[in-house]
């Protein structure tokens, strides 16, 4: 059990106050993390509170300002990037968000040697992506879907691609579906380690169907947003990977990297690119039916001036029980010999673990094992491998950092974080300097987050980078809810749950229950992290019990649980939420006449299906931006878990798993349906179809749309949304305002 101390003593009770909705909406109790911007083994940059860019040297203990806030302010810069030769800094301003990761911006180059902005051959605007080469100060950037190269910031640009066209051809940046569902980045270009070569992807969206929706704005006529967006079963983007020599790019031209034959034989995806050396690159490909992934290692043949990807350097990863990988196929971390690598994939027992691949995947050496999962490989040095896992004390919702000594035999394992601040810190990530000389640990909870700096050799803590003292002080007179993480064992399935309990929780009393659900494949909601959010307020002030349950389909507990939902989305996720609710009722402190469920996105889909399950368990519920039919969602995501919506594949379950098919079952629940009209991700179409089906079935429901808002419902919409949902729940639970 993880009990967050509420620090309530009888003598202090009258000085303590509950959380208010205003606290949440104002972000009063938000925390800070500190991620060093590493620039060498022992140096990092950090933007100070007063916006100076400061360089810190860990070994000398010295720090100095490399860029003043005055310079930053002169171009309204909100971000920066130092060139590896430390001669120039790019300053980013006029940030304009596009999709989840992508944005455009204006870039200025500042010359640190003369303290002036580079004049002549200035960068065009707005730029879609810009980055320095890993060595020196070459620049690659994407403008109007084409890639440009500058040998020096003041030089004229060399145009590498010419076919870029809005919504048609994307060079060096992903299209919508690759950005959201495959690469999870705003870029699709990669410098080789010393900057000799530049690899890039070209996405051809010419034949992709377009989603169109109105953006109302302030004009007399709304404008139409058009996005090439492949829904399940639709035509997909065509991807090609090119590599160009950046030293003399005008000569040989871009060279296309061959796709492995077994991949190219049908529709496929490119999933990631990893440079190994300047002359070796590793590409990962995935069949459209995403249970086969191929990792291909390609070498530059100097004599032929060509990239060679021999079949002997193709490594196949296949899943027979589900899809390849977890959410994404894992990426390799190469060792110092530049051919062998470490990679996370399922072992014979169905748990994701680190394997060492020297020649073939069949001969892989398993590095970690157990009924838990390795989650991320942070760094491989000559003698150590740093990774995170949820092994410690068998809590899947924890993350600790481990070091395996690969220089010695047999390799020894050490948990770096398990006992550092055991009560406060059970969920870590890490950031390593060059050669892992130093690293920062960022602890996300369950206590107040803290960031610390450590020696990479001894693991000794050097200093605290951020401990959120102000937050700690601010929370001293707040009655925080209690939190506990436990598990239910039901029919050979382990259901981990997090319960958030009112500060003066009394097991002998009855409380309204709110289930918060996400439940998407390879997600995890039950995590040992700190948060003061809307559900904290509902427990603290409104006296609700909130529960989060990780059912079948969720991550980091083995393939049996993860792949249980394969080709059957919308069945077991819902069943497991219902099962958990029944178990919570049995605990004796839940008022079974006041149970609600809510979720956003995939969670909106699950909450809708749970409400329409016909169990009579739920009095009311909320779906925010829900998927309503898998035929309406993105191909890359949907088909990974559902296959294709064709008669000879899985059309039947596509049809059976819609919210609309269960419209009649909403008759006996109070349903609040919410969606942004400019949702580029889960299109408003999803909620429009739910609403239509409910109207056609003559079922009453409540709805709220947010004009011109996307999937995140940000800004003032957030305040309106949570206020509206609070009123709805309080009304449902008969709580006075």
């Amino acid at each position: 059990i993880v009990l967050r101390p509420s620090r309530v003593h009888n003598s202090e009770e009258n000085t303590m106050r509950a959380l208010t909705l205003k606290d949440i909406l104002n972000g009063t109790f938000s925390y800070k993390t500190f991620f060093p911007n590493w620039i060498s083994g022992q140096e990092y940059l950090h933007q100070s509170a007063d916006n100076n860019i400061v360089l810190y040297n860990i070994e000398t203990g010295q720090s100095y300002t490399i860029l003043s806030n005055r310079t930053m302010k002169s171009v309204n810069a909100s971000n920066y990037g130092l060139s590896p030769d430390r001669q120039f800094v790019y300053l980013e301003s006029d940030y304009s968000k596009l999709w989840r990761y992508s944005y455009t911006a204006t870039y200025y180059i500042y010359d640190l040697s003369n303290g002036e902005f580079v004049r002549g051959n200035e960068l065009p605007r707005p730029i879609q992506y810009l980055c320095w080469s890993p060595v020196g100060s070459k620049l690659a950037y994407v403008y109007q879907n084409n890639i440009y190269l500058k040998q020096r910031p003041g030089d004229p640009p060399f145009q590498i691609t010419f076919n870029g066209r809005e919504n048609k051809i994307f060079n060096g940046i992903p299209d919508w579906v690759y950005e959201e569902e495959m690469l999870a980045t705003k870029y699709a270009l990669w410098w080789s380690p010393n900057g000799k070569f530049l690899a890039y992807a070209e996405f051809n969206d010419t034949d992709i169907p377009v989603i169109a929706y109105s953006y109302y704005g302030d004009e007399q006529y709304p404008r139409t947003i058009n996005i090439p967006y492949p829904k399940a079963g639709a035509k997909n983007p065509v991807v090609r990977i090119f590599i160009i020599d950046t030293t003399y790019p005008a000569y040989v031209g871009p060279q296309e990297v061959p796709v492995p034959a077994m991949i190219a034989s049908s529709d496929y995806y490119f999933s990631w690119l990893t440079w190994v050396t300047d002359e070796r690159v590793c590409l990962q490909w995935l069949k459209r039916v995403q249970n086969v992934s191929v990792l291909s290692i390609c070498d530059f043949r100097e004599d032929w001036q060509t990239w060679d990807c021999p079949k002997t350097q193709e490594h196949i990863e296949e899943s027979r029980t589900g899809w390849a990988g977890g959410f994404f196929v894992s990426t390799p971390v190469f060792s110092y010999d530049a051919i062998s690598y470490y990679k996370i994939f399922s072992d014979k027992d169905g748990y994701k673990h680190i394997h060492y691949i020297k020649d073939t995947v069949e001969n892989a050496i398993q590095i970690t094992s157990g009924k838990w999962e390795a989650i991320n490989i942070f760094r491989v040095t000559q003698d150590s491998l740093f990774y995170s896992s949820n092994e410690f004390e068998e809590y899947p919702g924890r993350r600790n950092i481990y070091r395996i000594s690969i220089g010695s035999y047999p390799p020894s394992k050490k948990c770096v974080t398990c006992h550092l601040r055991k009560e406060r810190c059970q969920y870590y990530t890490a950031s390593f300097s060059d050669y892992a000389k130093y690293y920062a640990l960022v602890c996300y909870g369950p206590g107040i987050p803290i960031s610390t700096l450590h020696d990479g050799r001894t693991d000794q803590e050097i200093k605290i980078l951020e401990e959120n003292k102000e937050l700690e002080n601010a929370l001293k007179n707040i009655q925080l809810p209690k939190e506990e993480i436990k598990k239910l064992e039901v029919d050979e399935i382990t259901l981990w749950y997090k319960m958030i309990l009112p500060p003066q929780f009394d097991r002998s009393k009855k409380y309204p229950l709110l289930i918060q659900v996400y439940g998407g494949p390879c997600s995890q909601s039950v995590r040992s992290v700190f948060a003061v959010n809307w559900i904290s307020y509902l427990a603290s002030k409104e006296g609700m019990v909130i529960a989060l349950v990780d059912g079948r389909g969720t991550a980091f507990q083995g393939d049996k649980l993860l792949y249980a939902v394969y080709r059957k989305l919308g069945v077991y996720e819902v069943e497991d939420q219902i099962t958990a609710v029944r178990k919570f009722i049995e605990m004796g402190f839940i008022d079974e006449k006041r149970i609600a469920i809510w979720g956003w996105s995939y969670g909106g889909y699950v909450s809708s299906l749970a409400l329409a399950s016909g169990t009579g368990l739920f009095k009311c519920g909320i779906a925010v931006a829900p998927v309503s039919s898998w035929e309406y969602y993105a191909s890359v995501y949907t088909e990974r878990f559902m296959g294709l919506p064709t008669k000879d594949d899985n059309l039947e379950h596509y049809k059976n798993s819609t919210v609309m098919a269960r419209a009649e079952y909403f008759r006996n629940v109070d349903y609040l349906l919410i969606h942004g009209t400019a949702d580029d991700n889960v299109h408003f179409q999803n909620s429009a179809q739910i609403a239509k089906a409910l109207v056609n079935a003559q079922v009453d429901f409540q709805a709220m749309w947010y004009s011109d808002q996307n999937h995140g419902l940000s800004g003032l919409s957030t305040n309106h949304l949570y206020t509206h949902m609070t009123h709805f729940l309080k009304q449902c639970f008969s709580l006075s305002d």
Partner: antibody, heavy 117, light 108 residues
Framework: EVQLLESGGGLVQPGGSLRLSCAAS????????MSWVRQSPGKGLEWVSA????????YYADSVKGRFTISRDNSKNTLYLQMNSLRAEDTAVYYC??????????WGQGTLVTVSS | EIVLTQSPGTLSLSPGERATLSCRAS???????LAWYQQKPGQAPRLLIN???RRATGIPDRFSGSGSGTDFTLTISRLEPEDFAVYYC?????????FGQGTKVEIK
């Protein structure tokens, strides 16, 4: 030894078509971008078109865009230039050259195209 | 497009003399994208100085390229009889690649 050998030139009437070929040997043809460069009688050099090694991307001078098509057959180590709607001003010696936009380090001997009625 | 202007149009020199040929670009090019070619009557052009001011394979060291930005120079330190020809500069930084109009180096 790198060799480029053009063929297919000749006399053609305005509005007519010709297809030039360039047979390559002595290097990994499929790895390199290739170009066509022309030279009008007694005049300077003019870049006409280029194609990258895989053949997937092509580039043209404005003067020939929409009329000329560059292509390649990597299995035959051959570069092509399909010329349609020929004009008098297209009269030139056409060279195939190894390279994309610059540093053309190998050239064929050229083939003469004469557009005249 | 980038216009390359070569000067002089004709250079009359004797064998053994130094030849300095100029190429001026209408906008910045940088040496990474400028090449020089030699062409003799009835022959195809031959690459002398590759992009990046590097001598092409088999080119004698009496040929050298220099310059940056918009002004570039091809220098032939001691003219040999076989060097009398037309010389072209060419930029490859911007589409379309363009050539200068040529400088003819003739025997005085």
């Amino acid at each position: 030894e790198v060799q480029l050998l053009e063929s297919g030139g000749g006399l053609v009437q305005p509005g007519g078509s010709l297809r030039l070929s360039c047979a390559a040997s002595g290097f990994t043809f499929s790895s390199f971008a290739m170009s066509w460069v022309r030279q009008s009688p007694g005049k300077g050099l003019e870049w006409v078109s280029a194609i990258i090694g895989s053949g997937s991307n092509t580039y043209y001078a404005d003067s020939v865009k929409g009329r000329f098509t560059i292509s390649r057959d990597n299995s035959k180590n051959t570069l092509y230039l399909q010329m349609n709607s020929l004009r008098a001003e297209d009269t030139a010696v056409y060279y195939c050259a190894k390279g994309w936009f610059g540093g053309f380090n190998y050239w064929g001997q050229g083939t003469l195209v004469t557009v005249s009625s | 497009e980038i216009v390359l202007t070569q000067s002089p149009g004709t250079l009359s020199l004797s064998p053994g003399e130094r030849a300095t040929l100029s190429c001026r670009a209408s906008q910045s090019v940088t040496s990474s994208y400028l090449a020089w070619y030699q062409q003799k009557p009835g022959q195809a052009p031959r690459l002398l100085i590759n992009v990046g001011s590097r001598r092409a394979t088999g080119i004698p060291d009496r040929f050298s390229g220099s310059g940056s930005g918009t002004d570039f120079t091809l220098t032939i330190s001691r003219l040999e009889p076989e060097d009398f020809a037309v010389y072209y500069c060419q930029q490859g930084i911007m589409l379309p690649p363009t050539f200068g109009q040529g400088t003819k180096v003739e025997i005085k």
